[in-house]
Interface confidence: medium
């Protein structure tokens, strides 16, 4: 009997998607590349449930972790790597006083119980996301 695995080895399944939490650190742009190399995308968050799940993963491991969000194109206008804008309800995920753009902080990370903006050239952990494989048929 063949078992269906919706996600690759060492990836985590959640609500129809697969997530890879890195064990090494890269800058934000290299994190994008790392995800593309495995057929995924630096994580774009689409729902409150997904945010809660990812925040928990990040805070449990006590790691600062890149997500696919930046205001590199236009200061103060936060945009996901898939081109979609940051929804108004998602602004509540920023930590107190963030984003503060201290010293050109243009990329978003999971930090503690919320989000922080930090310098994109800093090496951090990252999370990739891709659709889970279908197990029907």
């Amino acid at each position: 009997e063949r078992l269906c695995h919706p996600c690759p080895w060492e990836w985590t399944f959640f609500q129809g998607n697969c997530y890879f939490m890195s064990n090494s650190q890269r800058n934000w742009h290299d994190s994008i590349t790392a995800c593309q190399e495995v057929g995924a995308q630096l994580v774009v968050i689409k729902s409150a449930e997904e945010q809660n799940f990812l925040q928990l993963q990040s805070s449990r491991s006590n790691r600062f972790t890149w997500m696919g969000l930046s205001d590199l194109n236009h200061e103060g206008t936060w945009q996901w790597v898939d081109g979609s804008p940051l929804l108004p309800s998602f602004k509540q995920y920023w930590n107190k006083g963030e984003p503060n753009n201290v010293g050109e902080e243009d990329c978003a990370e999971f930090s503690g119980n919320g989000w922080n903006d930090d310098k994109c050239n800093l090496a951090k952990f990252w999370i990739c996301k891709k659709s889970a494989a279908s197990c029907s048929g």
Epitope: S47, N52, S89
Partner: antibody, heavy 122, light 106 residues
Framework: QVTLRESGPALVKPTQTLTLTCTFS??????????VSWIRQPPGKALEWLAL???????YYSTSLKTRLTISKDTSKNQVVLTMTNMDPVDTATYYC??????????????WGRGTLVTVSS | DIQLTQSPSTLSASVGDRVTITCRAS??????LAWYQQKPGKAPKLLIY???SLESGVPSRFTGSGSGTEFTLTISSLQPDDFATYYC????????FGQGTKVEIK
Amino acid sequence: QVTLRESGPALVKPTQTLTLTCTFSGFSLSTSGISVSWIRQPPGKALEWLALIDWDDDKYYSTSLKTRLTISKDTSKNQVVLTMTNMDPVDTATYYCARTPSGSYGRYFDLWGRGTLVTVSS
Amino acid sequence: DIQLTQSPSTLSASVGDRVTITCRASQSISNWLAWYQQKPGKAPKLLIYKASSLESGVPSRFTGSGSGTEFTLTISSLQPDDFATYYCQQYNSYWTFGQGTKVEIK
């Protein structure tokens, strides 16, 4: 001490434009994460959210009323202004302004003004 | 728009009673829900945020629970000061309030 206070006319005529001012102290609307909202409550009825303005000047409006509403801020005066056009007797309500705090726990309203009653009548 | 439905609309209770108010959302709002208390002629007062977090200064007899679409506010032992109207409010997508639950003296 954080306070918010609403001011504006107690009586407006139908078809007129209502202008309400929220004057606040104890916080700054230039602080990241801070927002100010307007919420109304017709006599004996439920609360209804109208509009919100963020620290970064993003503005959000109630779907059903957005064509009639404009929200703006004057950070230097610590004021938020709401204008509502084409007033009707059904707009008679107590109008509140409220603050949304900074932080990653969400955009709820932690502090409210006392409210100002606006009656629409000819 | 997300709709919130509170039940019951009115609740008659006595001092010392355990009181539960329910708030149902028309779609999932995760835990982005707040509860407010309002007394006649006064502004609403925040009790609970993020579904279960107690606002500073609010008595511990108030507890919130739930996630997704179903939420409850419980008052463990009703006090004379608790007779009021209670509103739930979601902030997952824009902002909407429930229609309110009036807690009155039996």
